[in-house]
């Protein structure tokens, strides 16, 4: 299996944005790569977003995706937005080297993303 590295812990910003790097040790010269972010919480795994990209090109997520990203060599910079406290969980980076064959699959150990909802502003008396 291909090795995938990602940070153990990331704290989302007060605006609910979390960014982390997903790095893979490519055993071959892939031209087409698929990156998938999975969220594991309470032993349930769900797909957060996925993108396929050509090496050297930008990642293209679906228009309604909460993810954006850029790639550089064997590194993918992933940003997840719109996070709330309830989205706290383990976010796993899955990398697939699709073409040319052979196919390689690597799954990271996950990044624990902590999301803290901002305190509401107290009402002002005028």
């Amino acid at each position: 299996a291909m090795h995938v590295a990602q940070p153990a812990v990331v704290l989302a910003s007060s605006r609910g944005i979390a960014s982390f790097v997903c790095e893979y040790a490519s055993p071959g010269k892939a031209t087409e790569v698929r990156v998938t972010v999975l969220r594991q919480a309470d032993s349930q795994v769900t797909e957060v977003c996925a993108a396929t990209y050509m090496m050297g090109n930008e990642l293209t997520f679906l228009d309604d995706s909460i993810c954006t990203g850029t790639s550089s060599g064997n590194q993918v910079n992933l940003t997840i937005q719109g996070l709330r406290a309830m989205d706290t969980g383990l976010y796993i980076c899955k990398v697939e080297l699709m073409y040319p064959p052979p196919y390689y699959l690597g799954i990271g150990n996950g990044t624990q993303i902590y999301v803290i909802d901002p305190e509401p502003c107290p009402d002002s008396d005028f």
């Epitope: 031209t31 050509m54 073409y99 040319p100 064959p101 052979p102 196919y103």
Partner: antibody, heavy 118, light 107 residues
């Protein structure tokens, strides 16, 4: 039900051109790579070309590189093979096939016959 | 290119017989070995992928085995409807290549 229907074959003179089409239905076309495979009369199967689901990756057999062009239109659920500079040895039944992992062709069309002869 | 060599090129067996077809790759293809069946005058159909996994709708009398460079397709009990040419195909490296085929007939 997965369905692949090829069209565009016919008789063409050496050096001529043809454009094959493959209409796909019964599955999400944009999720799958697609391939063309041919079979000369009385012979075995020969892989011709492949295009990935989003058309990022395109590959050809050595003998077809520069003469054949594979393309797809995901909005129309269609696959194409533009064949130029055709030779007698290109005479075959051309099959369009769906190709998922593990680089296997899991569903095939009924084929369209290409005959290159003067 | 990876060469795929099938043997025998043809065979004749009786209904109920166990039939074995072998496929040898010119180099290690890991588990990227697929088998196809083509009945006379018909379209090829995927039988087995990843060496041993049956494609949907394929009868359980078909099985695949092997590793590395040597692979086998077995029909445990030959049926009249199994008359066909069987092809192996490697997906490990481009160009994808097929074996020359094994024609199976009923005695």
């Amino acid at each position: 039900e997965v369905q692949l229907v090829e069209s565009g074959g016919g008789l063409v003179k050496p050096g001529g051109s043809l454009r094959l089409s493959c209409a796909a239905s019964g599955f999400t076309f944009s999720d799958y790579g697609m391939a063309w495979v041919r079979q000369a009369p009385g012979k075995g199967l020969e892989w011709v070309s492949f295009i990935s689901n989003l058309a990022y990756s395109v590959y050809y057999a050595d003998t077809e590189t520069g003469r054949f062009t594979i393309s797809r239109d995901n909005a129309k659920n269609s696959l194409y093979l533009q064949m130029n500079s055709l030779r007698a040895e290109d005479t075959a039944v051309y099959y369009c096939a769906r190709s998922g992992l593990p680089y296997a062709m899991d569903y095939w069309g009924q084929g369209t016959t290409v005959t290159v002869s003067s | 290119d990876i060469q795929m060599t099938q043997s025998p090129s043809s065979l004749s067996a009786s209904v109920g017989d166990r039939v074995t077809i072998t496929c040898r790759a010119s180099q290690d293809i890991s588990n990227y070995l697929n088998w196809y069946q083509q009945k006379p005058g018909k379209v090829p159909k995927l039988l087995i992928y990843y060496i041993s996994r049956l494609h949907s709708g394929v009868p359980s009398r078909f099985s695949g085995s092997g590793s590395g460079t040597d692979f086998t397709l077995t029909i445990s009990s030959l049926q009249p409807e199994d008359v066909a040419t069987y092809y192996c195909q490697q997906g490990r490296m481009l160009p994808w290549t097929f074996g020359g085929g094994t024609k199976v007939e009923i005695k």
